[in-house]
C-alpha cells in the first residue's frame, strides 16, 4: 500500500498556503482527486508529488494515491481543507445525475471542519426539502440523499452557519432518472387493416416509457412519415402518439407500416399490413376435407374459415339431407374471431346418429354477396351379417348378406362340429369371395353385398360360417345343418329353425 506524507488523514491549511503531498510506493504511483486549480504534479519513479504554492478553497478535497501495479489495488488517501472564511463550500459539480433508488451525492465539500455542526441542505431560494427526503452529511464528500426519487429532481444548496448567519453554496442540480427497463413499449393499431378504395382509414402508433427521452416514428414501406406528435403523461409514463388519418385511401397507401421507438436502452418496432381492395370480398375455406367419413356414434367438428371485408351481415349452418328435415341446433354452432377480417365457424356434431349423415352447408353474407361451403358426411358402420339356406337352379346354396360402410369383404369358413364361431383348430376349409354382389350402394347409406356358397351336400356335424369385415369392424353368422333341417346361428344368439 502506498504511503502519503504528511501521514495524517486530514490536513487543514489557510488560503495561499503551500501544500506538498508526497506519495511513495513499491512501484509507480498515481495521484487522483477532484479537478482543482494550481496543482503541480511531479512523478519520479516510485514517488509522486502533488503540490501547490497558492492553495485556494477549491483545492479542498480528498486526494488518493494508488499503485496501478499492485494486484490488491491498495490505496492511501488524505483530505485537504483549505479554510477560507469567505468560502465555506467547495462545490465539485453543479449537476448530479443518478438513477431512482440510488444514493445521490451532492458534492459540496466543507472547507472548514469546524463548521460541520451547523450545516444543512436546502432547496434553492431557501425552500425546505421535500417531505421524506432522507439525507446525511460527510464533510469530506458532501450531502447524500438516500434512495433518491424522481420527484427529488431539484436544485439544491448547501448551507453553513458562519458567525450566526447562513452562507449558501452555489446551487447543485440533481437529476434523478427513472430506471429504464428497456426500449419504449409500443402499440400499433390496428394490427391489420383492409379498406375499399375511397374509404377512410386511421393508423395509430404510440410509444410509452418511464423516461421522456425517447423517439417514436411511423414509416410506410421504409419511408418515414411526417406526422404531428401528441405527447401525454399519465400512470407515471410518458406517452407519444402518432395518428395517420387517410380520408380516401388508394392503392399507393397499401403496404407495410412500422411503428418504431428508441431510447438509450435500444429500439422496438412493430409492423402491420394495410391492404387496399377494389371491392368487397368474402372467401370461405376449410382446412378439413369437404368429404368426411366418421364412425357412427362418434363426434365431428366441421370448421369453416371466413375471410371477409366488410364484416359479415349474416351466416348459418344448414343440413341439406337426405335423411330428414332437421337443422343443426344453434347451440352446436360456434364462431370465433381470429382477427378483424378472419373468423372461424365451427359446427359440433356429437355422437352421430344414422339420420345425421348427409350434406352440411355453411352460408355467409356480406356486401360482396353470398357464399356457401358444403361438407359431405358419410357414416361408417361395422358389418351386419345374415345367412340363409336356399336352392338356386336346383342346387343347395348358402346365401350370406352383409351390410356396412365401407363395403364389407366376405369370407366363408367350414369347420367341424357345431359352433357359434369357427376357431382355427376346427377349420376344414376357407373360401374368400373377392367379388360379392353389391345389392345396394346409395350415398350416405350402408353398402349391402351378397355372397353365395353352393354346397352339394350339407355335412350334418359341421358348421358353415359367413364372416364380413371392413375398416370399422367385423360381423359373422354361423349356419349349422341339423337332421331336422338347416339351422343358422347368428353370433351370440340361440339356435333357430327357419
Amino acid at each position: 500500500i502506498p504511503v502519503i506524507e504528511p501521514s495524517v488523514p486530514e490536513l487543514v491549511v489557510k488560503p495561499g498556503a503551500t501544500v506538498t503531498l508526497r506519495c511513495v510506493g513499491n512501484g509507480s504511483v498515481e495521484w487522483d482527486g477532484p479537478p482543482s486549480p494550481h496543482w503541480t504534479l511531479y512523478s519520479d519513479g516510485s514517488s509522486s508529488i502533488l503540490s501547490t504554492n497558492n492553495a485556494t478553497f477549491q483545492n479542498t478535497g480528498t486526494y488518493r494515491c494508488t499503485e496501478p501495479g499492485d494486484p490488491l489495488g491498495g490505496s492511501a488517501a488524505i483530505h485537504l481543507y483549505v479554510k477560507d472564511p469567505a468560502r465555506p463550500w467547495n462545490v465539485l459539480a453543479q449537476e448530479v445525475v443518478v438513477f431512482e433508488d440510488q444514493d445521490a451525492l451532492l458534492p459540496c465539500l466543507l472547507t472548514d471542519p469546524v463548521l460541520e455542526a451547523g450545516v444543512s441542505l436546502v432547496r434553492v431560494r431557501g425552500r425546505p426539502l421535500m417531505r421524506h427526503t432522507n439525507y446525511s452529511f460527510s464533510p469530506w464528500h458532501g450531502f447524500t440523499i438516500h434512495r433518491a426519487k424522481f420527484i427529488q429532481s431539484q436544485d439544491y444548496q448547501c448551507s453553513a452557519l458562519m458567525g450566526g448567519r447562513k452562507v449558501m453554496s452555489i446551487s447543485i442540480r440533481l437529476k434523478v432518472q427513472k430506471v429504464i427497463p428497456g426500449p419504449p413499449a409500443l402499440t400499433l393499431v390496428p394490427a391489420e387493416l383492409v379498406r375499399i378504395r375511397g374509404e377512410a382509414a386511421q393508423i395509430v402508433c404510440s410509444a410509452s416509457s418511464v423516461d421522456v427521452n425517447f423517439d417514436v416514428f411511423l414509416q410506410h414501406n421504409n419511408t418515414k412519415l411526417a406526422i404531428p406528435q401528441q405527447s401525454d403523461f399519465h400512470n407515471n409514463r410518458y406517452q407519444k402518439v402518432l395518428t395517420l388519418n387517410l380520408d380516401q385511401v388508394d392503392f399507393q397507401h397499401a403496404g407495410n407500416y412500422s411503428c418504431v421507438a428508441s431510447n438509450v436502452q435500444g429500439k422496438h418496432s412493430t409492423s402491420m399490413f394495410f391492404r387496399v381492395v377494389e371491392s368487397a370480398y368474402l372467401n370461405l375455406s376449410s382446412e378439413q376435407n369437404l368429404i368426411q367419413e366418421v364412425t357412427v356414434g362418434e363426434g365431428l367438428n366441421l370448421k369453416v374459415m371466413v375471410e371477409a371485408y366488410p364484416g359479415l351481415q349474416g351466416f348459418n349452418w344448414t343440413y341439406l339431407g337426405p335423411f330428414s328435415d332437421h337443422q343443426p341446433e344453434p347451440k352446436l354452432a360456434n364462431a370465433t374471431t381470429k382477427d378483424t377480417y378472419r373468423h372461424t365457424f365451427t359446427l359440433s356434431l356429437p355422437r352421430l346418429k344414422p339420420s345425421e349423415a348427409g350434406r352440411y352447408s355453411f352460408l355467409a353474407r356480406n356486401p360482396g354477396g353470398w357464399r356457401a361451403l358444403t361438407f359431405e358426411l358419410t357414416l361408417r358402420y361395422p358389418p351386419e351379417v345374415s345367412v340363409i339356406w336356399t336352392f338356386i337352379n336346383g342346387s343347395g346354396t348358402l346365401l350370406c348378406a352383409a351390410s356396412g360402410y365401407p363395403q364389407p369383404n366376405v369370407t366363408w369358413l367350414q369347420c367341424s362340429g357345431h359352433t357359434d364361431r369357427c376357431d382355427e383348430a376346427q377349420v376344414l376349409q376357407v373360401w374368400d369371395d373377392p367379388y360379392p354382389e353389391v345389392l345396394s350402394q346409395e350415398p350416405f347409406h350402408k353398402v349391402t353385398v351378397q355372397s353365395l356358397l353352393t354346397v352339394e351336400t350339407l355335412e350334418h356335424n359341421q358348421t358353415y360360417e359367413c364372416r364380413a369385415h371392413n375398416s370399422v369392424g367385423s360381423g359373422s353368422w354361423a349356419f349349422i345343418p341339423i337332421s331336422a333341417g338347416a339351422h343358422t346361428h347368428p353370433p351370440d344368439e340361440f339356435l333357430f329353425t327357419p
Epitope: 498515481e30 495521484w31 487522483d32 482527486g33 477532484p34 479537478p35 482543482s36 486549480p37 494550481h38 496543482w39 503541480t40 504534479l41 511531479y42 502533488l50 477549491q58 488518493r64 494508488t66 496501478p68 489495488g73 490505496s75 465539485l92 459539480a93 453543479q94 449537476e95 448530479v96 445525475v97 443518478v98 440510488q102 445521490a104 451525492l105 458534492p107 464528500h141
Partner: antibody, heavy 117, light 109 residues
Framework: QVQLQESGPGLVKPSETLSLTCTVS????????WSWIRQPPGKGLEWIGY???????NYNPSLKSRVTTSVDTSKNQFSLKLRSVTAADTAVYYC???????????WGQGTMVTVSS | SSELTQDPAVSVALGQTVRITCQGD??????ASWYQQKPGQAPILVIY???NRPSGIPDRFSGSSSGNTASLTITGAQAEDEADYYC????????????FGRGTKLTVL
Amino acid sequence: QVQLQESGPGLVKPSETLSLTCTVSGGSISSYYWSWIRQPPGKGLEWIGYVYYSGSTNYNPSLKSRVTTSVDTSKNQFSLKLRSVTAADTAVYYCARDRLGIAFDIWGQGTMVTVSS
Amino acid sequence: SSELTQDPAVSVALGQTVRITCQGDSLRSYYASWYQQKPGQAPILVIYGKNNRPSGIPDRFSGSSSGNTASLTITGAQAEDEADYYCNSQDNSGNHLVVFGRGTKLTVL
C-alpha cells in the same frame, strides 16, 4: 492496465438523441473523473463534459442544455446522451480518464457518429 | 470561459528542435497538458503538469510554462513525431471546465 471502449450507433437522425456508452476494463470506475471529448472531421478536440462515479457532472457551457452524462458502477460503464442533434454534431466521440483536472491520460479508440437523415 | 491559442502549423527539419506554444489566461493558474494525435488515431498524452512524461513517451518531449504561455519542446525531432499537437487546461472560471487549443500541425521535413 485500464482500457476504454466506446460503443453506440454510428448513424443518428437529426433532432434525435445520440447515445454512447464507454466501458472501463482493467480497473474500477469508482475513482477518477471520466470525460467525453469529440472531434468533428478535420477539426480540433472539444471537451463535452465529465462524470464522477457518484454521479457528479460538469459540462461544456456550449453543450450543457443538450447533454447528460451518467455512470453505472455495477457495469463499470459511463454514458453520454446528446439531445436534438444536428449535422454539426457529426464527429468522432472519445471517452477518456481525467486525472485531477490536469490531464486525460487514457483514451478510448473513438467512435464515429454521423448525424444524417 | 478561456480560450487557448495555438499556431495552426509548424515545421522542423529532421533531428532539429522545435517548440510548439499555447497561450491563454488560464495558463497563469493551470499547467497545460499536451497531446499528440496521428491521423485516424486517438490522442496520446505526452506531457502533463509542470513537466511530466507518462511512461513510454520519449525524453525528447518536454514541457515548460511562463506567464500565460505553455510550451512543448521536441529536441531532435523524428519522422514519427509528425502529427497534430493539442494543448489543454482548465479554464479560469473556477468551475473546473476544460478547454483545448485548436491544435498545431507539426511537419517533419
